[in-house]
Amino acid sequence: QERRFQLEGPESLTVQEGLCVLVPCRLPTTLPASYYGYGYWFLEGADVPVATNDPDEEVQEETRGRFHLLWDPRRKNCSLSIRDARRRDNAAYFFRLKSKWMKYGYTSSKLSVRVMALTHRPNISIPGTLESGHPSNLTCSVPWVCEQGTPPIFSWMSAAPTSLGPRTTQSSVLTITPRPQDHSTNLTCQVTFPGAGVTMERTIQLNVSYAPQKVAISIFQGNSAAFKILQNTSSLPVLEGQALRLLCDADGNPPAHLSWFQGFPALNATPISNTGVLELPQVGSAEEGDFTCRAQHPLGSLQISLSLFVHWKPEGRAGGV
């Protein structure tokens, strides 16, 4: 005749796909010290065990290597360890202690294991800031993964120049040497749990610090269309009295500080405008000459100059004599 005992703890446990769970089981205190038998965990309904310490009994194909009976009769332990949880593990389980020498066995109550979709996602950590041209180590980690599970497979996707660094069961390191053009591009860490056939990923946008590479001046003359200067220009003819708006813009991350100087400034010169915009409401002789826009950045500066050449209005010139 079968003797029954109650599994301690909750009637159901939840585990996420690909992860691990321990189904607790303690042998009944009434079990005689002389009782010698084998332990078997069964999925409710199926008569092939999912885990056992009986060398003559083979377990289910689906659970082989993933389900383990943690058998320690002296400590009354009969717990079931499940790793690489799969959707099909979602079921009720019970434990049976059977002896080939005793007339009776022990059967536990049922416990349900609920396998949920994996909601955890990998973490990507970046030490400090990413600087153009400087290698940095990025770490993709899955701290919620159990050590005894099948190690996950890490894969990285990025347009930036990279090389793989060391990895552990729970993390992978990627060395990245970003370029200015890699700023705002995506970097993805994908983690696959081969034991359960589940893949999770996290994508971040790279924030790459880089000095300005390009500085340009847009020129607005009265109501006429703007034109852009991308390199130092020897001279730009402007009509006397005309309103001129010079707009400087530069790349760089974080954005460079833009300022305007008249002439070719020394490092500590005082700017005539502390923004990228220089308004010249009426061009006259005072404005003839060079104007320089400087893009200042912690990682380096860049500047561009243009030379204004003033055309005098004929009547204005005659009236002045």
Partner: antibody
Framework: EVQLQQSGPELVKPGASVKMSCKAS????????MHWVKQSHGKSLEWIGN????????SYNQKFKGKATLTVNKSSSTAYMELRSLTSEDSAVYYC??????????????WGQGTTLTVSS | QIVLTQSPAIMSASPGEKVTMTCSVS?????MHWYQQKSGTSPKRWIY???KLASGVPARFSGSGSGTSYSLTISSMEAEDAATYYC?????????FGAGTKLELK
């Protein structure tokens, strides 16, 4: 839908051997042992034994040890039973059956349609 | 091994009549299961865990009992109920069956 499809009727001579099959479908073959049950004409049912499809491990009713041999082909989800040294006592319908094994009880939940064995000279 | 004794071996009942058949066990078991078998077909699980009806089994069937005495009851006999009913235990190995009760329609 769970199905157990058994091979057709057999007419064999005394002393000979016979091998019958049971093809399973509609469930994971390796999750359940395959059981065999004998029903002599107009008589009750007797459990012969079972086989674990994962390793071919068998368990027999003492009465049928030496008479029946259970084997399995995992790749085709088919179980076999060979009966040897046949006598008229072995004339019967033989069923393969799947067992429901629960924490509180155990019974046969699915049966094959049966293979009729007639031993006659 | 555990011996199951079914009685009566054969019985007949008229439509609408209440039918009870019993299964006595040589030593106490936790549960009893019943199978229905009609001529030329394989047994069908009919009642399991002593009192639970298998799917598709009419509600006029019921099962009860404990220990060494179990029974199957039909509250109101119908023609389609004519069959042989076997009790079965699996509280200990090997699993054993009763010799069956053949129920005929009067």
């Amino acid at each position: 839908e769970v199905q157990l499809q058994q091979s057709g009727p057999e007419l064999v001579k005394p002393g000979a051997s016979v091998k019958m099959s049971c093809k399973a479908s509609g469930y994971t073959f390796t999750d359940y042992k395959m059981h065999w049950v004998k029903q002599s004409h107009g008589k009750s049912l007797e459990w012969i034994g079972n086989i674990n499809p994962n390793n071919g491990g068998t368990s027999y009713n003492q009465k049928f040890k030496g008479k029946a041999t259970l084997t399995v082909n995992k790749s085709s989800s088919t179980a076999y039973m060979e009966l040897r040294s046949l006598t008229s006592e072995d004339s019967a319908v033989y069923y393969c059956a799947r067992r429901y094994y629960g924490s509180s009880s155990s019974y046969f939940d699915y049966w094959g349609q049966g293979t009729t064995l007639t031993v006659s000279s | 091994q555990i011996v199951l004794t079914q009685s009566p071996a054969i019985m007949s009942a008229s439509p609408g009549e209440k039918v009870t058949m019993t299964c006595s066990v040589s030593s106490s078991v936790s549960y009893m299961h019943w199978y229905q078998q009609k001529s030329g077909t394989s047994p069908k699980r009919w009642i399991y865990d002593t009192s639970k009806l298998a799917s598709g089994v009419p509600a006029r069937f019921s099962g009860s009992g404990s220990g060494t005495s179990y029974s199957l009851t039909i509250s109101s006999m119908e023609a389609e109920d004519a069959a042989t009913y076997y009790c079965q235990q699996w509280s200990s190995n090997p699993p054993t069956f009763g010799a069956g009760t053949k129920l005929e329609l009067k």
